[in-house]
Interface confidence: low
């Protein structure tokens, strides 16, 4: 006769491992007992369990409550056992030794491989600011056995680099995602994808990119210079910019204080009925935690009694 077993049994951490051992004998042969032992290299054999044809299942105290026979119906020639709730320390070599009548003893070895699924973690890099060069956006680390695969899923253009650290029973893989920050990346998902044979499906952790920026400022409202004449109501200047974090706005007049009656409402400067007093250079100052920008315009309030053309000068500075 001969023993049938597997070279390798693979199980996920926490699952039950079936250690197969079946004696295929000639007619009339009987199995007296099946002894299971842990036989890692450099260490003596440690008995795990013994299945006796008459006295039943015996389990080592070290494995109490963790070794069982497969559920019935059972073939008397089947010496397989179940190792419940596999842990990483169970990984190693096991030997099945079958004592038969009248053929004698047979033995076979198998390797138990316990897959340890990774628990990935994603760590954002330093704050991203437009204008930076290649910058770490995030790093993703996953440790498992065997070593997991760590990749990135994103629409954002960038570069990746990976490194691996081997431990006694596992390996940690870290992948970094670098990019050149731009405002178009704001709100874009950056997803770390971890693959591993112990996972039913890939694990995904998403980080939302936040890139600080401040756009150039400009002022709207002076497009039709003929509207800026004495007596006009509802005249206003609007400061245009955008940023992350959202910017705040401040209005000043370069050639003196803001005239009385002029209302500042965030990005908008509202004028009372226009007089020549409202002529001057107005500055919009836009700022956020990242940067600041200025844009200045010259307002020249026309007197309809005069034919002189209105002068408008637009200047942007940052």
């Amino acid at each position: 006769g001969e023993l049938e077993t597997s070279d390798v049994v693979t199980v996920v951490l926490g699952q039950d491992a079936k250690l197969p051992c079946f004696y295929r004998g000639d007619s009339g042969e009987q199995v007296g007992q099946v002894a299971w032992a842990r036989v890692d290299a450099g260490e003596g054999a440690q008995e795990l369990a013994l299945l006796h044809s008459k006295y039943g299942l015996h389990v080592s105290p070290a494995y109490e409550g963790r070794v069982e026979q497969p559920p019935p119906p059972r073939n008397p020639l089947d010496g397989s056992v179940l190792l419940r709730n596999a842990v990483q320390a169970d990984e190693g070599e096991y030997e099945c030794r079958v004592s038969t009548f009248p053929a004698g003893s047979f033995q076979a070895r198998l390797r138990l491989r316990v897959l340890v699924p990774p628990l990935p973690s994603l760590n954002p890099g330093p704050a991203l600011e437009e204008g930076q060069g290649l910058t770490l956006a995030a790093s993703c680390t996953a440790e498992g056995s065997p070593a997991p695969s760590v990749t990135w899923d994103t629409e954002v253009k960038g570069t990746t680099s990976s490194r691996s650290f081997k431990h006694s029973r596992s390996a940690a893989v870290t992948s970094e995602f670098h990019l050149v920050p731009s405002r178009s990346m704001n709100g874009q998902p950056l997803t770390c994808v971890v693959s591993h044979p112990g996972l039913l499906q890939d694990q995904r952790i998403t980080h939302i990119l936040h890139v600080s920026f401040l756009a150039e400022a400009s002022v709207r409202g002076l497009e039709d210079q003929n509207l800026w004449h004495i007596g006009r109501e509802g005249a206003m200047l609007k400061c245009l910019s955008e940023g992350q974090p959202p910017p705040s706005y401040n209005w000043t007049r370069l050639d003196g204080p803001l005239p009385s009656g002029v209302r500042v409402d965030g990005d908008t400067l509202g004028f009372p009925p226009l007089t020549t007093e409202h002529s001057g250079i107005y500055v919009c100052h836009v700022s956020n935690e990242f940067s600041s920008r200025d844009s200045q315009v010259t307002v020249d309030v026309l007197d309809p009694q005069e034919d002189s053309g209105k002068q408008v000068d637009l200047v942007s500075a940052s």
Partner: nanobody
Framework: QVQLVESGGGLVQPGGSLRLSCAAS????????MGWYRQAPGKQRELVAT???????NYADSVKGRFTISRDNAKNTVYLQMNSLKPEDTAVYYC????????????????WGQGTQVTVSS
């Protein structure tokens, strides 16, 4: 583990309004950013609006002036008031959130709700 439960989706005519709500539970720590993403059929999931615990706002250009995000920190709930709805706003709207961990560091995990369908059609 943070659980996010959305409500308020439905069918609405163009020009109409809807208000979405999302309640976060299961967290012993401070919820940081909360907000909304959406995904139309055959398209990538895209940002709609997000709000920080301090009240700073972020809107997608396509919804500025029409949608308003708000938040009740005490209830860990975020709302999205959607006005002047257009057919192109039709999508599954997902609530999203992240949180601070026990040491005050921001957790790297982004949590997602199951999504609520918004259909804009006459």
């Amino acid at each position: 583990q943070v659980q996010l439960v959305e409500s308020g989706g439905g069918l609405v005519q163009p020009g109409g309004s809807l208000r979405l709500s999302c309640a976060a539970s299961g967290s012993d720590f401070t919820i940081n950013v909360m907000g909304w993403y959406r995904q139309a059929p055959g398209k990538q999931r895209e940002l709609v609006a997000t709000v920080t615990s301090g009240g700073s706002l972020n809107y997608a250009d396509s919804v500025k002036g029409r949608f308003t995000i708000s938040r009740d920190n005490a209830k860990n709930t975020v709302y999205l008031q959607m006005n002047s709805l257009k057919p192109e706003d039709t999508a599954v709207y997902y609530c999203t959130a992240d949180q601070f961990g026990p040491l005050g560091h921001l957790s790297p995990i982004i949590y997602w709700g199951q999504g609520t369908q918004v259909t804009v059609s006459s």
